[in-house]
């Protein structure tokens, strides 16, 4: 008999949903490793980055309803009491405890589909989600450390003679900024209360044969490059070109 083992390779399916919202579903990678088990069934946890403002679907282990007694989703969000959504097969009843976010729901009736959905993921959905399937011979668990990703707003401008500033504003997690060519750079990070981070990189180029510089912003939501032509005139400002 096989209990699923933790797997680092994520199977992220993306499609378009109503209201033009992207939807991602992270369920078990079918090529997972399995092992023999007795009564203690392995706990499987997956770290899952998901973009803000998309829809997310979280899945339980692959166990047929006929084998189940109770299905429970346990949701632990920062600064909130633990929320549980439970379905008891024998009585066909669902029960919720401390669940206030109406965007987190069963995909459909739990007797038809045990998946959990988060409609329009927000920063506040960062947390731990766990499906617990109770069978007569033990429990199966599937856990998700949900990390909400926020795409930073990227700007690039020249503020002084041969000095450029590249900013990745309110990203989650913090973006990484690099320059081509490399210059004399200073980078600062500003942390916001909602968990986002603004990264500001200021670079100066003494070498006069450098006329165009590129700021490259790396982020889990995608990478972005902007370039600017360095103006020799002090105090002149030039906005960036995206490519």
């Amino acid at each position: 008999e096989g209990a699923a083992q933790p797997n680092n390779s994520l199977m992220l399916q993306t499609s378009k949903e109503n209201h033009a919202l992207a939807s991602s579903s992270l369920c078990m990678d079918e090529k997972q490793i399995t092992q023999n088990y007795s009564k203690v069934l392995a706990e499987v946890n997956t770290s899952w980055p998901v973009k803000m403002a998309t829809n997310a679907v979280l899945c339980c282990p692959p166990i047929a309803l006929r084998n189940l007694i109770i299905i429970t989703w346990e949701i632990i969000l920062r600064g909130q009491p633990s929320c549980t959504k439970a379905y008891k097969k024998e009585t066909n009843e669902t029960k919720e405890t401390n669940c206030t976010d109406e965007r987190i729901t069963w995909v459909s009736r739990p007797d038809q589909n045990s998946d959990l959905q988060i409609r329009t993921v927000a920063i506040t959905h960062d947390g731990y989600y766990r499906c617990i399937m109770v069978t007569p011979d033990g429990n199966f668990h599937r856990g998700y450390h949900l990390q909400v990703l926020v795409t930073p707003e990227v700007t690039l401008f020249q503020n002084r003679n041969r000095t450029a500033v590249c900013k990745a504003v309110a990203g989650k997690p913090a973006a990484h900024i690099s320059w081509i060519p490399e210059g004399d750079c200073a980078t600062k990070q500003e942390y916001w209360s909602n968990g986002t981070v603004t990264v500001k990189s200021t670079c100066h180029w003494e070498v006069h044969n450098v006329s165009t510089v590129t700021c490259h912003v790396s982020h889990l939501t995608g990478n972005k490059s902007l370039y600017i032509e360095l103006l020799p005139v002090p105090g002149a400002k030039k906005s960036a070109k995206l490519y």
Partner: antibody, heavy 119, light 110 residues
């Protein structure tokens, strides 16, 4: 070690009934759903139905509804499959198989019981 | 009900050959990231033996020359290098709510 041991071969006349037993050992009998599957000579495997000894839930293939009856004796850790109104086309090997939770797969099978229906 | 169509129904092969068997479902057997398709081997007078479960997971104790792939409606069982003990009949099987078996593929000695 998980084992499923079935009753011996049977020869029946058309119109009669047959009851095949499947004795389970090596695990808690009430914890797992038991399926019944048959295989006629040279034919594909065919699902008859299942019984969940935990709560006595049963489900049958439409083809066998009204003719097949699945029961279990928890104290004896035994599942039974009774098929009535036998016809010659019911001649087959009948298997019990324990459904394992993860993926709803069959790791453990009985050795099979040959039921011959002949006048 | 979901119908499973296996092909070929029989094939002749030699020891060491790579063998591929396909199974097509009348509708998708994949749900919630899992494909509820299993593969069994059966020898005369014996019950089926599980080889692959959930489309691609190798059952404990099964040689690594057996592998499974596919999702949705199309699935494949591959034996990378056929061994003398592999001559048997192979079945695909779906078991989510209702149980269905494919028609079987008999692998014979060439």
């Amino acid at each position: 070690e998980v084992q499923l041991v079935q009753s011996g071969a049977e020869v029946k006349k058309p119109g009669a009934s047959v009851k095949v037993s499947c004795k389970a050992s090596g695990y808690t009998f009430t914890s797992y759903v038991m399926f019944w599957v048959r295989q006629a000579p040279g034919q594909r495997l065919e699902w008859i139905g299942y019984i969940n000894p935990y709560n006595d839930d049963t489900k049958y293939n439409e083809k066998f509804k009204g003719r097949a009856t699945l029961t279990s004796d928890k104290s004896a850790s035994t599942a039974y499959m009774e098929l009535s109104s036998l016809r010659s086309e019911d001649t087959a090997v009948y298997y019990c198989a324990r459904e394992d939770y993860y993926g709803s797969r069959f790791v453990y099978w009985g050795q099979g019981t040959l039921v011959t229906v002949s006048s | 009900d979901i119908q499973l169509t296996q092909s070929p129904s029989s094939l002749s092969a030699s020891v060491g050959d790579r063998v591929t068997i396909t199974c097509r479902a009348s509708k998708s057997v994949s749900t919630s990231g899992y494909s509820y398709m299993h593969w069994y081997q059966q020898k005369p007078g014996k019950p089926p033996k599980l080889l692959i479960y959930l489309a691609s997971n190798l059952e404990s104790g099964v040689p690594s020359r057996f592998s499974g792939s596919g999702s949705g409606t199309d699935f494949t069982l591959t034996i990378s290098s056929l061994q003398p003990e592999d001559f048997a009949t192979y079945y695909c099987q779906h078991n989510r709510e209702l149980l269905t078996f494919g028609g079987g593929t008999k692998v014979e000695i060439k």
